[in-house]
Protein backbone atom coordinates (compact mmCIF):
# COMPACT_ATOMS: atom_id res chain seq x y z
CA UNK A 1 0.00 0.00 0.00
CA UNK A 2 1.45 3.35 -1.09
CA UNK A 3 0.43 6.99 -1.29
CA UNK A 4 0.09 8.06 -4.92
CA UNK A 5 -0.78 11.73 -4.29
CA UNK A 6 0.39 13.15 -0.95
CA UNK A 7 -2.17 14.77 1.35
CA UNK A 8 -3.05 18.38 0.67
CA UNK A 9 -5.01 20.27 3.29
CA UNK A 10 -7.12 23.41 3.53
CA UNK A 11 -8.41 25.11 6.66
CA UNK A 12 -11.62 27.03 7.24
CA UNK A 13 -9.61 29.05 9.78
CA UNK A 14 -12.10 28.23 12.47
CA UNK A 15 -12.52 24.63 13.48
CA UNK A 16 -12.03 22.26 10.54
CA UNK A 17 -9.18 21.45 8.19
CA UNK A 18 -9.80 19.07 5.32
CA UNK A 19 -7.07 16.85 3.91
CA UNK A 20 -7.33 14.85 0.70
CA UNK A 21 -4.98 12.29 -0.86
CA UNK A 22 -4.91 9.38 -3.27
CA UNK A 23 -3.66 5.86 -2.75
CA UNK A 24 -2.10 3.67 -5.43
CA UNK A 25 -5.16 1.44 -5.64
CA UNK A 26 -8.70 0.96 -4.33
CA UNK A 27 -8.66 1.48 -0.57
CA UNK A 28 -11.19 1.27 2.23
CA UNK A 29 -9.97 4.51 3.81
CA UNK A 30 -11.94 4.27 7.07
CA UNK A 31 -10.79 0.77 7.96
CA UNK A 32 -7.26 0.75 6.56
CA UNK A 33 -5.93 4.24 7.24
CA UNK A 34 -5.55 6.76 10.06
CA UNK A 35 -4.31 10.35 9.83
CA UNK A 36 -2.70 11.58 13.05
CA UNK A 37 -2.32 15.33 13.55
CA UNK A 38 -0.69 17.26 16.35
CA UNK A 39 -0.17 20.94 17.09
CA UNK A 40 3.53 21.71 17.36
CA UNK A 41 3.49 22.62 21.05
CA UNK A 42 5.28 20.74 23.78
CA UNK A 43 2.18 19.79 25.75
CA UNK A 44 -0.11 18.94 22.85
CA UNK A 45 -1.22 15.41 22.02
CA UNK A 46 -1.86 13.67 18.72
CA UNK A 47 -5.45 13.45 17.49
CA UNK A 48 -6.71 10.75 15.18
CA UNK A 49 -8.78 11.42 12.08
CA UNK A 50 -10.65 8.52 10.47
CA UNK A 51 -10.69 9.16 6.73
CA UNK A 52 -13.63 8.62 4.39
CA UNK A 53 -13.53 7.40 0.82
CA UNK A 54 -13.49 10.02 -1.89
CA UNK A 55 -13.64 7.96 -5.07
CA UNK A 56 -12.03 4.53 -5.44
CA UNK A 57 -8.46 5.39 -4.44
CA UNK A 58 -9.14 8.79 -2.88
CA UNK A 59 -9.44 9.57 0.82
CA UNK A 60 -10.60 12.65 2.71
CA UNK A 61 -10.22 13.50 6.38
CA UNK A 62 -11.79 16.30 8.41
CA UNK A 63 -9.41 17.45 11.15
CA UNK A 64 -11.14 19.06 14.13
CA UNK A 65 -9.32 21.97 15.76
CA UNK A 66 -10.30 24.07 18.76
CA UNK A 67 -9.38 27.25 16.94
CA UNK A 68 -6.66 28.50 14.62
CA UNK A 69 -4.11 31.31 14.79
CA UNK A 70 -1.67 32.39 12.11
CA UNK A 71 1.46 30.79 13.58
CA UNK A 72 -0.05 27.36 14.29
CA UNK A 73 1.78 24.44 12.71
CA UNK A 74 0.68 20.80 12.72
CA UNK A 75 2.54 17.59 12.11
CA UNK A 76 0.68 15.01 10.03
CA UNK A 77 1.32 11.25 10.03
CA UNK A 78 -0.57 8.90 7.72
CA UNK A 79 -0.65 5.34 9.03
CA UNK A 80 -1.80 2.02 7.62
CA UNK A 81 -1.86 -0.13 10.72
CA UNK A 82 1.72 -0.06 12.08
CA UNK A 83 3.18 1.25 8.82
CA UNK A 84 3.93 4.95 8.44
CA UNK A 85 3.02 5.79 4.85
CA UNK A 86 3.68 9.52 4.87
CA UNK A 87 4.85 12.26 7.21
CA UNK A 88 4.36 15.97 6.66
CA UNK A 89 3.33 19.25 8.19
CA UNK A 90 0.53 21.74 7.68
CA UNK A 91 0.22 25.41 8.56
CA UNK A 92 -3.50 26.23 8.43
CA UNK A 93 -3.01 29.97 7.89
CA UNK A 94 -1.14 29.30 4.65
CA UNK A 95 -3.91 27.16 3.16
CA UNK A 96 -7.22 28.85 3.94
CA UNK A 97 -10.49 28.18 2.18
CA UNK A 98 -13.19 30.26 3.88
CA UNK A 99 -16.54 28.87 4.85
CA UNK A 100 -19.36 29.61 2.41
CA UNK A 101 -21.68 32.51 3.27
CA UNK A 102 -25.20 31.55 4.23
CA UNK A 103 -28.78 32.82 4.41
CA UNK A 104 -28.74 34.53 1.03
CA UNK A 105 -31.95 36.52 0.71
CA UNK A 106 -33.24 38.71 -2.10
CA UNK A 107 -35.44 41.59 -0.98
CA UNK A 108 -37.57 42.76 -3.90
CA UNK A 109 -39.82 45.29 -2.18
CA UNK A 110 -37.41 48.23 -2.18
CA UNK A 111 -38.69 50.50 -4.99
CA UNK A 112 -37.19 48.94 -8.08
CA UNK A 113 -33.98 48.09 -6.24
CA UNK A 114 -32.90 44.56 -5.51
CA UNK A 115 -31.26 44.16 -2.11
CA UNK A 116 -29.31 40.95 -1.64
CA UNK A 117 -28.15 40.12 1.88
CA UNK A 118 -26.29 37.16 3.30
CA UNK A 119 -24.60 36.13 6.52
CA UNK A 120 -20.90 36.28 7.28
CA UNK A 121 -19.92 32.65 7.98
CA UNK A 122 -17.60 33.58 10.87
CA UNK A 123 -18.28 34.74 14.44
CA UNK A 124 -17.11 38.27 15.31
CA UNK A 125 -14.14 37.01 17.35
CA UNK A 126 -12.65 35.20 14.35
CA UNK A 127 -9.94 37.06 12.44
CA UNK A 128 -11.61 36.46 9.08
CA UNK A 129 -14.88 38.07 10.19
CA UNK A 130 -13.63 41.54 9.26
CA UNK A 131 -11.53 40.47 6.29
CA UNK A 132 -13.95 38.78 3.90
CA UNK A 133 -14.94 40.15 0.53
CA UNK A 134 -17.52 38.54 -1.69
CA UNK A 135 -18.54 37.69 -5.23
CA UNK A 136 -22.23 37.51 -6.07
CA UNK A 137 -23.28 35.48 -9.08
CA UNK A 138 -26.67 36.21 -10.66
CA UNK A 139 -28.01 34.26 -13.63
CA UNK A 140 -31.19 33.75 -15.55
CA UNK A 141 -32.85 30.38 -15.47
CA UNK A 142 -34.19 31.01 -18.99
CA UNK A 143 -31.07 32.38 -20.68
CA UNK A 144 -27.68 30.76 -19.93
CA UNK A 145 -25.93 33.77 -21.49
CA UNK A 146 -27.49 36.08 -18.90
CA UNK A 147 -24.83 35.39 -16.27
CA UNK A 148 -23.08 38.07 -14.22
CA UNK A 149 -20.68 38.46 -11.30
CA UNK A 150 -20.70 41.39 -8.87
CA UNK A 151 -17.60 41.88 -6.74
CA UNK A 152 -18.41 43.13 -3.24
CA UNK A 153 -15.15 44.61 -1.96
CA UNK A 154 -16.61 46.30 1.12
CA UNK A 155 -17.21 44.43 4.38
CA UNK A 156 -20.99 44.66 4.57
CA UNK A 157 -22.60 41.39 3.42
CA UNK A 158 -25.07 42.99 1.05
CA UNK A 159 -25.47 44.15 -2.54
CA UNK A 160 -27.89 46.64 -4.05
CA UNK A 161 -28.60 46.64 -7.75
CA UNK A 162 -31.28 48.28 -9.84
CA UNK A 163 -33.92 45.77 -10.82
CA UNK A 164 -33.84 47.30 -14.28
CA UNK A 165 -30.33 45.96 -14.88
CA UNK A 166 -32.00 42.55 -15.14
CA UNK A 167 -34.74 41.54 -17.51
CA UNK A 168 -38.25 41.92 -16.24
CA UNK A 169 -40.76 39.11 -16.03
CA UNK A 170 -38.31 36.23 -15.73
CA UNK A 171 -36.80 34.20 -12.90
CA UNK A 172 -33.26 34.70 -11.65
CA UNK A 173 -31.02 32.85 -9.24
CA UNK A 174 -28.22 34.21 -7.08
CA UNK A 175 -25.42 32.71 -5.04
CA UNK A 176 -22.46 34.19 -3.14
CA UNK A 177 -18.96 33.11 -2.20
CA UNK A 178 -16.19 34.64 -0.10
CA UNK A 179 -12.44 35.07 0.07
CA UNK A 180 -9.94 36.95 2.23
CA UNK A 181 -7.05 38.84 0.69
CA UNK A 182 -5.12 38.99 3.95
CA UNK A 183 -4.36 35.26 3.84
CA UNK A 184 -4.46 34.98 0.04
CA UNK A 185 -7.18 32.38 0.47
CA UNK A 186 -8.90 30.38 -2.20
CA UNK A 187 -12.55 31.16 -2.86
CA UNK A 188 -15.09 29.49 -0.62
CA UNK A 189 -17.70 27.17 -2.08
CA UNK A 190 -20.78 28.93 -3.40
CA UNK A 191 -23.65 29.40 -1.01
CA UNK A 192 -26.91 27.61 -1.80
CA UNK A 193 -28.67 29.62 -4.49
CA UNK A 194 -31.88 31.51 -4.00
CA UNK A 195 -34.53 32.22 -6.65
CA UNK A 196 -36.80 35.18 -7.31
CA UNK A 197 -39.04 36.50 -10.06
CA UNK A 198 -37.76 39.81 -11.36
CA UNK A 199 -40.43 42.36 -12.16
CA UNK A 200 -40.38 46.12 -12.14
CA UNK A 201 -42.36 48.98 -13.62
CA UNK A 202 -41.02 50.02 -17.00
CA UNK A 203 -40.48 53.79 -17.08
CA UNK A 204 -42.92 55.67 -19.37
CA UNK A 205 -41.30 56.63 -22.63
CA UNK A 206 -41.67 60.29 -23.44
CA UNK A 207 -41.86 61.38 -27.08
Amino acid sequence: MKVLQEPTCVSDYMSISTCEWKMNGPTNCSTELRLLYQLVFLLSEAHTCIPENNGGAGCVCHLLMDDVVSADNYTLDLWAGQQLLWKGSFKPSEHVKPRAPGNLTVHTNVSDTLLLTWSNPYPPDNYLYNHLTYAVNIWSENDPADFRIYNVTYLEPSLRIAASTLKSGISYRARVRAWAQCYNTTWSEWSPSTKWHNSYREPFEQH
Partner: antibody, heavy 116, light 110 residues
Framework: EVQLLESGGGLVQPGGSLRLSCAAS????????MSWVRQAPGKGLEWVSS????????YYADSVKGRFTISRDNSKNTLYLQMNSLRAEDTAVYYC?????????WGQGTLVTVSS | QSVLTQPPSASGTPGQRVTISCTGS????????VNWYQQLPGTAPKLLIY???QRPSGVPDRFSGSKSGTSASLAISGLRSEDEADYYC???????????FGGGTKLTVL
Protein backbone atom coordinates in the same frame (compact mmCIF):
# COMPACT_ATOMS: atom_id res chain seq x y z
CA GLU B 1 -15.82 32.28 30.11
CA VAL B 2 -12.70 30.37 31.15
CA GLN B 3 -12.34 30.14 34.94
CA LEU B 4 -9.69 28.48 37.08
CA LEU B 5 -10.10 28.35 40.85
CA GLU B 6 -7.27 27.11 43.05
CA SER B 7 -7.80 25.80 46.58
CA GLY B 8 -5.99 23.80 49.24
CA GLY B 9 -3.32 26.30 50.24
CA GLY B 10 -2.48 27.09 53.84
CA LEU B 11 0.15 26.90 56.55
CA VAL B 12 2.16 23.68 56.83
CA GLN B 13 5.27 22.68 58.74
CA PRO B 14 8.53 21.80 56.98
CA GLY B 15 8.43 18.15 55.90
CA GLY B 16 4.63 18.23 55.73
CA SER B 17 2.28 17.64 52.83
CA LEU B 18 -0.44 19.57 51.07
CA ARG B 19 -2.71 18.89 48.10
CA LEU B 20 -3.73 21.75 45.86
CA SER B 21 -6.74 21.60 43.55
CA CYS B 22 -7.70 23.69 40.56
CA ALA B 23 -11.33 23.57 39.44
CA ALA B 24 -11.76 24.47 35.77
CA SER B 25 -14.86 25.68 33.94
CA UNK B 26 -15.81 27.43 30.73
CA UNK B 27 -13.86 25.13 28.38
CA UNK B 28 -13.47 21.45 27.55
CA UNK B 29 -10.96 20.57 30.25
CA UNK B 30 -9.97 17.20 28.75
CA UNK B 31 -8.74 18.90 25.55
CA UNK B 32 -6.14 21.08 27.24
CA UNK B 33 -2.79 20.68 28.94
CA MET B 34 -2.53 22.28 32.39
CA SER B 35 0.32 23.64 34.49
CA TRP B 36 1.28 24.90 37.92
CA VAL B 37 3.38 28.05 38.33
CA ARG B 38 4.43 29.57 41.64
CA GLN B 39 5.59 32.95 42.88
CA ALA B 40 7.48 33.40 46.15
CA PRO B 41 6.66 36.60 48.05
CA GLY B 42 8.24 39.57 46.27
CA LYS B 43 9.90 37.30 43.69
CA GLY B 44 9.37 36.34 40.05
CA LEU B 45 7.42 33.52 38.43
CA GLU B 46 8.71 29.94 38.59
CA TRP B 47 7.28 27.07 36.56
CA VAL B 48 6.53 24.00 38.69
CA SER B 49 4.92 21.29 36.57
CA SER B 50 2.80 20.57 33.47
CA UNK B 51 0.56 17.73 32.35
CA UNK B 52 -0.78 16.92 28.87
CA UNK B 53 -4.54 16.63 28.17
CA UNK B 54 -4.78 12.90 28.82
CA UNK B 55 -2.07 12.88 31.48
CA UNK B 56 0.27 10.81 29.33
CA UNK B 57 3.08 13.40 29.41
CA UNK B 58 4.23 15.04 32.63
CA TYR B 59 7.07 17.50 33.30
CA TYR B 60 8.54 18.84 36.55
CA ALA B 61 10.98 21.55 37.51
CA ASP B 62 14.18 20.13 39.06
CA SER B 63 13.39 22.00 42.29
CA VAL B 64 10.28 19.87 42.94
CA LYS B 65 11.11 16.59 41.19
CA GLY B 66 10.53 13.59 43.45
CA ARG B 67 8.52 15.65 45.94
CA PHE B 68 5.57 17.01 43.94
CA THR B 69 3.09 15.06 41.81
CA ILE B 70 0.80 16.63 39.23
CA SER B 71 -2.39 14.81 38.22
CA ARG B 72 -5.78 15.49 36.73
CA ASP B 73 -9.29 14.10 36.81
CA ASN B 74 -10.92 14.93 33.49
CA SER B 75 -14.29 13.65 34.70
CA LYS B 76 -14.22 16.25 37.47
CA ASN B 77 -12.56 19.04 35.46
CA THR B 78 -9.94 19.29 38.17
CA LEU B 79 -6.14 19.60 38.26
CA TYR B 80 -4.14 18.57 41.34
CA LEU B 81 -0.72 19.13 42.83
CA GLN B 82 0.30 16.78 45.61
CA MET B 83 3.17 18.39 47.53
CA ASN B 84 5.26 16.27 49.92
CA SER B 85 8.43 16.94 51.94
CA LEU B 86 7.68 20.64 51.86
CA ARG B 87 10.49 23.13 52.51
CA ALA B 88 10.56 26.79 53.51
CA GLU B 89 11.58 27.69 49.94
CA ASP B 90 8.30 26.22 48.65
CA THR B 91 6.45 29.13 50.26
CA ALA B 92 4.66 30.90 47.42
CA VAL B 93 1.41 31.70 45.72
CA TYR B 94 0.61 28.72 43.47
CA TYR B 95 -1.22 29.42 40.22
CA CYS B 96 -2.79 26.89 37.90
CA UNK B 97 -2.78 27.81 34.23
CA UNK B 98 -4.36 26.42 31.11
CA UNK B 99 -1.59 25.55 28.69
CA UNK B 100 -2.44 25.96 25.03
CA UNK B 101 0.29 27.52 22.87
CA UNK B 102 1.32 29.26 26.09
CA UNK B 103 -0.13 29.67 29.59
CA UNK B 104 -3.17 31.41 28.20
CA UNK B 105 -5.46 31.54 31.25
CA TRP B 106 -4.47 31.76 34.92
CA GLY B 107 -6.28 31.29 38.20
CA GLN B 108 -6.02 33.82 41.01
CA GLY B 109 -3.68 31.62 43.02
CA THR B 110 -3.59 29.98 46.44
CA LEU B 111 -0.98 30.79 49.09
CA VAL B 112 1.16 28.02 50.54
CA THR B 113 3.22 28.91 53.60
CA VAL B 114 5.83 26.45 54.89
CA SER B 115 6.94 27.47 58.34
CA SER B 116 7.50 26.01 61.78
CA GLN C 1 19.48 33.29 38.56
CA SER C 2 17.27 32.86 35.50
CA VAL C 3 18.56 31.50 32.20
CA LEU C 4 16.55 34.28 30.54
CA THR C 5 17.95 37.70 31.31
CA GLN C 6 15.69 40.74 31.58
CA PRO C 7 16.48 44.23 32.88
CA PRO C 8 15.08 44.48 36.42
CA SER C 9 13.40 47.80 35.68
CA ALA C 10 12.27 50.08 32.88
CA SER C 11 10.41 53.37 32.80
CA GLY C 12 8.78 55.85 30.48
CA THR C 13 6.37 58.74 30.38
CA PRO C 14 2.79 58.51 29.08
CA GLY C 15 2.69 58.31 25.30
CA GLN C 16 6.28 57.11 25.03
CA ARG C 17 7.48 53.83 23.54
CA VAL C 18 9.44 51.47 25.78
CA THR C 19 11.17 48.22 24.94
CA ILE C 20 11.97 45.34 27.31
CA SER C 21 14.64 42.87 26.25
CA CYS C 22 14.99 39.18 27.04
CA THR C 23 18.24 37.37 26.31
CA GLY C 24 18.66 33.61 26.27
CA SER C 25 20.50 30.93 24.33
CA UNK C 26 20.04 28.43 21.50
CA UNK C 27 18.52 25.88 23.89
CA UNK C 28 15.64 28.19 24.76
CA UNK C 29 14.83 31.38 22.81
CA UNK C 30 16.92 30.33 19.80
CA UNK C 31 14.76 27.27 19.08
CA UNK C 32 11.45 27.81 20.87
CA UNK C 33 8.54 30.22 20.85
CA VAL C 34 8.75 33.12 23.27
CA ASN C 35 5.81 34.20 25.42
CA TRP C 36 5.37 37.40 27.40
CA TYR C 37 3.22 37.80 30.51
CA GLN C 38 1.99 40.92 32.26
CA GLN C 39 1.35 40.96 36.00
CA LEU C 40 -0.46 44.00 37.31
CA PRO C 41 0.09 44.76 41.02
CA GLY C 42 -1.72 42.26 43.25
CA THR C 43 -3.16 40.21 40.39
CA ALA C 44 -2.46 36.96 38.57
CA PRO C 45 -0.26 37.01 35.46
CA LYS C 46 -1.90 37.45 32.06
CA LEU C 47 -0.72 36.25 28.65
CA LEU C 48 0.36 39.22 26.56
CA ILE C 49 2.29 37.71 23.62
CA TYR C 50 2.69 34.13 22.39
CA UNK C 51 4.47 32.55 19.40
CA UNK C 52 7.06 35.37 19.64
CA UNK C 53 4.75 38.05 18.28
CA GLN C 54 1.09 36.98 18.41
CA ARG C 55 -1.40 38.88 20.57
CA PRO C 56 -4.34 37.06 22.20
CA SER C 57 -7.70 38.66 21.51
CA GLY C 58 -8.27 41.57 23.85
CA VAL C 59 -4.62 42.62 24.07
CA PRO C 60 -4.19 46.10 22.55
CA ASP C 61 -1.98 46.43 19.49
CA ARG C 62 0.18 48.85 21.48
CA PHE C 63 1.92 45.68 22.68
CA SER C 64 4.16 43.91 20.18
CA GLY C 65 6.71 41.14 20.42
CA SER C 66 9.68 40.24 18.25
CA LYS C 67 12.53 37.76 18.24
CA SER C 68 15.94 37.65 16.61
CA GLY C 69 18.35 34.80 17.20
CA THR C 70 18.61 34.19 20.93
CA SER C 71 16.99 37.46 22.04
CA ALA C 72 13.40 38.63 22.25
CA SER C 73 11.82 42.02 22.85
CA LEU C 74 8.52 43.39 24.07
CA ALA C 75 7.63 46.87 22.84
CA ILE C 76 4.89 49.01 24.35
CA SER C 77 3.93 52.12 22.40
CA GLY C 78 1.67 54.93 23.55
CA LEU C 79 2.53 54.12 27.16
CA ARG C 80 -0.32 54.48 29.66
CA SER C 81 -0.41 54.58 33.43
CA GLU C 82 -2.31 51.27 33.51
CA ASP C 83 0.69 49.59 31.82
CA GLU C 84 2.61 49.86 35.09
CA ALA C 85 3.27 46.21 35.93
CA ASP C 86 5.82 43.41 35.98
CA TYR C 87 6.60 41.84 32.60
CA TYR C 88 8.04 38.35 32.19
CA CYS C 89 9.41 36.60 29.12
CA UNK C 90 9.25 32.81 29.06
CA UNK C 91 9.97 29.82 26.83
CA UNK C 92 10.83 26.13 26.91
CA UNK C 93 14.47 25.24 27.54
CA UNK C 94 15.39 21.99 25.79
CA UNK C 95 18.59 21.36 27.71
CA UNK C 96 16.89 21.85 31.09
CA UNK C 97 13.64 20.16 29.97
CA UNK C 98 11.88 22.99 31.75
CA UNK C 99 9.70 25.98 31.04
CA UNK C 100 11.76 28.98 32.09
CA PHE C 101 10.77 32.54 33.00
CA GLY C 102 12.92 35.61 32.87
CA GLY C 103 13.51 37.38 36.17
CA GLY C 104 10.88 39.98 35.32
CA THR C 105 11.01 43.68 34.50
CA LYS C 106 9.19 46.23 36.63
CA LEU C 107 7.80 48.92 34.36
CA THR C 108 7.17 52.33 35.91
CA VAL C 109 5.12 54.98 34.14
CA LEU C 110 6.50 58.32 35.29
Amino acid sequence: EVQLLESGGGLVQPGGSLRLSCAASGFTFSNYAMSWVRQAPGKGLEWVSSISPSGSSIYYADSVKGRFTISRDNSKNTLYLQMNSLRAEDTAVYYCARSYRAFDYWGQGTLVTVSS
Amino acid sequence: QSVLTQPPSASGTPGQRVTISCTGSSSNIGNNDVNWYQQLPGTAPKLLIYYDSQRPSGVPDRFSGSKSGTSASLAISGLRSEDEADYYCATWDASLSAYVFGGGTKLTVL
